[in-house]
Amino acid sequence: SHTLPVRLLRPSDDVQKIVEELQSLSKMLLKDVEEEKGVLVSQNYTLPCLSPDAQPPNNIHSPAIRAYLKTIRQLDNKSVIDEIIEHLDKLIFQDAPETNISVPTDTHECKRFILTISQQFSECMDLALKSLTSGAQQATT
């Protein structure tokens, strides 16, 4: 196999740029989703975000996040999600397990799912960027 050592493929400046891009795109998605009035956040959905037992950026649950965003893309045609997925794929290993999402069937519940996950994704990218930058600071001290 030609698969190369991971260290060749993860300059920290690239990872930070990817997460910064994801953070910016998550804000765009949330702004778009929030334009739908009368929809409330639900306690029934939780987006996996950071894993406590891994180092940044491997601590980001990128495959699960991708699956949730792919579900939103199928429920509501948000083109920004295409770009989000392309950037998440930069953090996902080819052999990462698939995540199955149970999709709400009720129209209003679908809207609540989209808003809730979009909000959690935005918060998650803020946390991911913080964990990256604090990790980088620790590495230099």
Epitope: S1, H2, T3, L4, V6, L8, L9, P11, D13, D14, K17, I18, K70, D82, E83, I85, E86, H87, D89, K90, L91, I92, F93, Q94, D95, A96
Partner: antibody, heavy 122, light 107 residues
């Protein structure tokens, strides 16, 4: 050994469609993007679109949107590129290509099909 | 869409010369850039990926480097078998556009 084998040369009339296939062997992973590229005689490489075969997720160049459809059949490890409303300027060699791991996103296309010559002529 | 501006479009150099080809991205694409070599009538071949990593089996005279949004392919000592057209391609976000190509000839 990873191999990409494309379908044979085609001669088509203007206004018709062509469907080129690309069969992958020796590759077991599902999280990757495969791309389609074309090259007109004496011209450079032109990106047409890509597919994530595991999900059938596609991306297209704005230039070909509405005329190109990329699909994949997971059961046979085959990708397809269909181009409709053909015109003489679509005469080109069409290539499929895909990357080596370890990430789902590409950073270079390691494997290329042998190319399929499509000639559009009345 | 991200534009890739490749220069020069063609060059002629002597065997043993150092040759440099440049691609400039219209925005920051990190290290998500590849270089290909295409000989006349042949399939493109990956030379460099991730801006500076050599693909398997590529001679050591080929190297890639990056400075900001400028990417350089260097052939340290041009050989007759290096006569080809060279292309860059970015992979930051779709469309994954190519540079216009650089045709390399021997003087």
């Amino acid at each position: 050994q990873v191999q990409l084998v494309q379908s044979g040369a085609e001669v088509k009339k203007p206004g018709s469609s062509v469907k080129v296939s690309c069969k992958a062997s020796g590759y077991t992973r599902t999280r990757y993007w495969m791309q389609w590229v074309r090259q007109a005689p004496g011209q450079g490489l032109e990106w047409m679109g890509a597919i994530y075969p595991g999900e059938g997720d596609t991306r297209y160049s704005q230039k070909f949107k509405g005329r190109v459809t990329i699909t994949a059949d997971k059961s046979t490890s085959t990708a397809y590129m269909e181009l409709s409303s053909l015109r003489s300027e679509d005469t080109a060699v069409y290539y499929c290509a895909f990357p080596e791991g370890p990430y789902a996103a590409p950073y270079g296309m390691h494997y290329w099909g042998q190319g399929t010559t499509v000639t559009v002529s009345s | 869409a991200i534009q890739m501006t490749q220069s020069p479009s063609s060059l002629s150099a002597s065997v043993g010369d150092r040759v440099t080809i440049t691609c400039r991205a219209s925005r920051n694409i990190g290290n998500y850039l590849a270089w290909y070599q295409q000989k006349p009538g042949k399939v493109p071949k990956l030379l460099i990926y991730y801006a500076k990593t050599s693909a398997s089996g590529v001679p050591s005279r080929f190297s890639g480097s990056r400075s900001g949004t400028d990417y350089t392919l260097t052939i340290s000592s041009l050989q007759p078998e290096d006569v080809a057209t060279y292309y860059c391609q970015h992979f930051w976000s779709t469309p994954w556009t190519f540079g216009g190509g650089t045709k390399v000839e021997i003087k």
